[in-house]
């Protein structure tokens, strides 16, 4: 015998209390699939998250974060705070990236600038805290009596310790 | 199960601060909204203000010059601080979290037991 | 002065069924869902249903709420000396940003 309930589309529910008919869902609810016995309650974007999609019958709303923040997790579960470039987030909130690393983005961690000579190559744009370090070409692929393009060593930035 | 703690002094003076922290147990403070909302004897509940858990905060417009709500993760903890208070301030405070927002739906679900802060010289 | 306008009292005899009424505008119940919440003397307020009709684990389903355009109701069947209490309505409200209440609406159980 057929379930009676197969035959409510998406955005309706099977209503027990109304002898299994279909009834649309309720304001603030949603089915996205047909057999529903039950409308699932629509995301609400508030506060730090902003709508994306308003809920409809049949599909949940969508969110995405208010300017300064950006999303985490599947399908923007989380809002996590925007720092600037060269700075990663920490518990205490945003922090310069540390000497000799680099964040290019306004989320993420810093990373260690690229160790050129590990490739055989020098260093032709020091590294910053926002950008990483640009190398060359290796010291003998110079040609002969040219100088050499490695910068000197910068110097350590105050406040900056090698992690 | 998540349980919430205020602490903080009972009793400021007339245009001094308040200051009250909440401490939050048995849960982690990630992914939430952090809300105080206070009670003045026999009267209504009023939104002070929230902070979620990444640093956004909003308050109550009738506060918002007076209000800093702040949060340390690391401790679990976050706070309030109310300047200039006068005898309007006396209330209970109630520190509470609130999921609204994010996947959450429940909004306000869990509360600390309040506590009393009375403005008086 | 609160944004959500409640009845201050209601009350009722045991077994009768009560309903406590909530009013808002479009910026808060017009557009968002309700809360309703207890309050026992003394205590914090513990929440009784979210999103206008959802009763939380635990809460009996002799507890049930609906809402229609800017005003939301509660009802209460078969009312129990231990219902007497506070009940306070909620809702976001997109002006403020922020949560509104209701100024409480005391339940006073006759007899």
């Known amino acids: 015998l057929q379930d009676p309930c197969s035959n409510c589309p998406a955005g309706t529910f099977c209503d027990n209390n109304r002898n299994q008919i279909c009834s649309p869902c309720p304001p603030n609810s949603f089915s996205s699939a047909g057999g529903q016995r039950t409308c699932d309650i629509c995301r609400q974007c508030k506060g730090v998250f902003r709508t994306r999609k308003e809920c409809s019958s049949t599909s949940n709303a969508e969110c995405d974060c208010t300017p300064g923040f950006h999303c985490l997790g599947a399908g923007c579960s989380m809002c996590e705070q925007d720092c600037k470039q060269g700075q990663e987030l920490t518990k205490k909130g945003c922090k310069d990236c540390c000497f000799g690393t680099f964040n290019d983005q306004k989320r993420g961690i810093c990373r260690p600038w690229t160790n050129c000579s590990l490739d055989g190559k020098s260093v032709l744009v020091n590294g910053t805290k926002e950008r990483d370090v640009v190398c060359g070409p290796s010291p003998a692929d110079l040609s002969p009596g040219a100088s050499s393009v490695t910068p000197p060593a910068p110097a350590r930035e105050p406040g900056h310790s090698p992690q | 199960q998540v349980q919430l703690q205020e602490s903080g002094p009972g009793l400021v003076k007339p245009s001094e601060t308040l200051s009250l922290t909440c401490t939050v147990s048995g849960g982690s403070i990630s992914s939430y909204y952090w809300t105080w909302i206070r009670q003045p004897p026999g009267k209504c509940l009023e939104l002070v203000g929230y902070i979620y858990y990444s640093g956004y905060t909003s308050y109550n417009p009738s506060l918002k010059s007076r209000v800093t709500i702040s949060i340390d993760t690391s401790k679990n903890q976050f706070s309030l601080q109310l300047n200039s208070v006068t005898a309007a301030d006396t209330a209970v405070y109630f520190c509470?979290?609130?999921?609204?927002?994010?996947?959450?739906?429940?909004?306000?679900?869990?509360w600390g037991q309040g506590t009393t802060v009375t403005v008086s010289s | 002065q609160s944004v959500l306008t409640q009845p201050p009292s209601a009350s009722g005899t045991p077994g009768q069924r009560v309903t406590i009424s909530c009013s808002g505008s479009?910026?808060?119940?017009?557009?968002?869902?309700v809360n309703w919440y207890r309050q026992l003397p003394g205590t914090a307020p513990k929440l009784l249903i979210y999103s206008n009709n959802q009763r939380p684990s635990g809460v009996p389903d002799r507890f049930s709420g609906s809402k229609s355009g800017t005003s939301a109701s509660l009802a209460i069947s078969g009312l129990q000396s231990e219902d007497e209490a506070d009940y306070y309505c909620a809702a976001w409200d997109d002006s403020l940003n922020g949560w509104v209440f209701g100024c409480g609406t005391k339940l006073t159980v006759l007899g």
């Open positions: 479009s910026s808060n119940i017009g557009n968002n869902p």
């Open positions: 509470a979290r609130d999921d609204y927002g994010g996947n959450g739906y429940y909004g306000v679900d869990v």
